[in-house]
Interface confidence: low
């Protein structure tokens, strides 16, 4: 018995060939011997089967002795043994229809689970193997689960269903809703304007939801909601904003926030959350702010940084075009009785300068100038 695999919703063509290459009488029946379709001369006739409107043949092939049964918009319950009766012989074809669907939605938040469910006819024992866009293979039976979806899981998942040495392939497009970056860090000198950007890693026609930026300043004991906003069809509208600092927010995507000036009391880390309409859970992006301040008080030249710095970072004070006077893996460095000239405070990581602040030290009778 020939086995044919079909996909739910697709069209399948079951072949039936006569030895005579001419149009002769044929009938297709199901396992209950109910006539599906046949011919009367050059006319197609249909029987009382449940397939009625979805069953068809190709009249153009009859003259060549081919009498296919075409079933459109396949359903799982179409799985059956179909019998073609032609020239006093019977050809049997077993049709097995499978369906593969993603749980609830194909748009999932980063970190959520994807469950693929296989619909299969009774009595079948298929195996399923799916390949993610990043090449990860998952195997399973009736259900396949992938926990903790990542951004790289966005794209077309290709799943192969294997039954009776035959296979059928499904393609499912999955969109992982996430920010482009999980975390970012901004380095600023005191007083500079700070720009925070939160680009999304996906595009959808309509994007509606609400968001909030919570900020944990290094100096503060608890976190604070800096801004809450609504997103309606990709238009951003601020709901409420703290006055210290007074954030500005762009009205269009990508989400963009401006802090009027960097100050030590603002240095710290924030968590922007975005709750999308009809989605459980939230998108998150962490943002960090490091602020540098260089000051001269009497005979002491000091450079300090605030915010989440890694222990690898080096803070240095040097006179322009000279070797560093002081370099430490600390958040504050100083030089006593600095000589006159342009001093540089540098925050660097493995030789790469992340932040630089210049301060002019005048001869001892003058006051310092900060360019």
């Amino acid at each position: 018995k020939k086995v044919v695999l079909g996909k739910k919703g697709d069209t399948v063509e079951l072949t039936c060939t006569a030895s005579q290459k001419k149009s002769i009488q044929f009938h297709w029946k199901n396992s209950n011997q109910i006539k599906i379709l046949g011919n009367q001369g050059s006319f197609l006739t249909k029987g009382p089967s449940k397939l009625n409107d979805r069953a068809d043949s190709r009249r153009s092939l009859w003259d060549q002795g081919n009498f296919p049964l075409i079933i459109k918009n396949l359903k799982i319950e179409d799985s059956d043994t179909y019998i073609c009766e032609v020239e006093d012989q019977k050809e049997e074809v077993q049709l097995l229809v499978f369906g593969l669907t993603a749980n609830s939605d194909t748009h999932l938040l980063q970190g959520q689970s994807l469950t693929l469910t296989l619909e299969s006819p009774p009595g079948s024992s298929p195996s399923v193997q799916c390949r993610s866009p990043r090449g990860k293979n998952i195997q399973g039976g009736k259900t396949l689960s992938v926990s903790q979806l990542e951004l790289q899981d966005s794209g077309t998942w290709t799943c192969t269903v294997l039954q009776n040495q035959k296979k059928v392939e499904f393609k499912i497009d999955i969109v992982v809703l996430a920010f482009q970056k999980a975390s970012s860090i901004v380095y600023k000198k005191e007083g500079e304007q700070v720009e925070f950007s939160f680009p999304l890693a996906f595009t959808v026609e309509k994007l509606t939801g609400s968001g909030e930026l919570w900020w944990q300043a290094e100096r503060a004991s608890s976190s604070k909601s800096w801004i809450t906003f609504d997103l309606k069809n990709k238009e951003v509208s601020v709901k409420r904003v703290t006055q210290d600092p007074k954030l500005q927010m762009g009205k269009k995507l990508p989400l963009h926030l401006t802090l009027p000036q960097a100050l030590p009391q603002y240095a710290g880390s924030g968590n922007l959350t975005l709750a999308l309409e009809a989605k459980t859970g939230k998108l998150h992006q962490e943002v960090n702010l490091v602020v540098m301040r260089a000051t001269q008080l009497q005979k002491n030249l000091t450079c300090e940084v605030w915010g989440p710095t890694s222990p690898k970072l080096m803070l240095s004070l040097k006179l322009e075009n000279k070797e560093a006077k002081v370099s430490k893996r600390e958040k504050a460095v100083w030089v006593l009785n600095p000589e006159a000239g342009m001093w540089q405070c540098l925050l660097s990581d493995s030789g790469q300068v992340l932040l630089e602040s210049n301060i002019k030290v005048l001869p001892t009778w003058s006051t310092p100038v900060q360019p």
Partner: antibody
Framework: QVQLQQSGPELVKPGASVRMSCKAS????????IHWVKQRTGQGLEWIGE????????YSNAKFKDKATLTADKSSNTAYMQLSSLTSEDSAVYFC???????????WGQGTLVTVSA | DIVLTQSPASLAVSLGQRATISCKAG??????????MNWYQQKPGQPPKLLIY???NLESGIPARFSGSGSGTDFTLNIHPVEEEDAATYYC?????????FGAGTKLELK
């Protein structure tokens, strides 16, 4: 259509507490903030605070910080406000409200009258 | 807190005439090109009804005889022509900064 249905009037003794409810319907409860507003008889309006039903985050007017506790139950689409240590000053009508598309309160509950009397 | 001072406290206007209510904020309520001032109408035994949001936007379903204007700290609600059903108390409210605050109200009566 959007509706905010508030619980009935309350007569309470000084020093006691009262909990009133505001049941939302006609929209996705977690998508909008619920605000609470106080109005004493013949007086103006005072903003008490707001609750984000999705997260449970509540923000109160400093004046009501020790007076009002705002909560929300996502499963029943209901916001609650509890007033404690009641005095005659707390006798008022309390409204819950929700923003529309703009920044104003486009939707209001019918109000809950609280009378504090010995 | 941002104090909103409404004037007059009450006014009487003839049918078909113009009613003008003023609201002064203790500090600017402008942000990113918008003025965060709203106006409400309240009748006895009813909750307030939103008329105008963001200084000049007419809430849906509100007749065009109501209009709002102003920016920064000075705002105005105009009703023209006044109709019998407009007798009520009118409040301004800022949604710029917590705590949100309301004006003391202006009672509009018909002559």
């Amino acid at each position: 259509q959007v509706q905010l249905q508030q619980s009935g009037p309350e007569l309470v003794k000084p020093g006691a507490s009262v909990r009133m409810s505001c049941k939302a319907s006609g929209y996705t409860f977690t998508d909008y903030v619920i605000h609470w507003v106080k109005q004493r008889t013949g007086q103006g309006l005072e903003w008490i605070g707001e609750i984000y039903p999705g997260s449970g985050s509540a923000y109160s007017n400093a004046k009501f910080k020790d007076k009002a506790t705002l909560t929300a139950d996502k499963s029943s689409n209901t916001a609650y406000m509890q007033l404690s240590s009641l005095t005659s000053e707390d006798s008022a009508v309390y409204f819950c409200a929700r923003r529309g598309n703009g920044t104003g309160f486009a939707y209001w509950g019918q109000g809950t009258l609280v009378t504090v009397s010995a | 807190d941002i104090v909103l001072t409404q004037s007059p406290a009450s006014l009487a206007v003839s049918l078909g005439q113009r009613a003008t209510i003023s609201c002064k904020a203790g500090q600017s309520v402008d942000y990113d090109g918008d003025s965060y001032m709203n106006w409400y109408q309240q009748k006895p035994g009813q909750p307030p009804k939103l008329l105008i949001y963001v200084a000049s936007n007419l809430e849906s379903g509100i007749p065009a005889r109501f209009s709002g204007s102003g920016s920064g700290t000075d705002f105005t609600l105009n009703i023209h022509p006044v109709e019998e059903e407009d007798a009520a108390t009118y409040y301004c409210q800022q949604s710029y900064k917590d705590p949100l605050t309301f004006g003391a109200g202006t009672k509009l009566e018909l002559k």
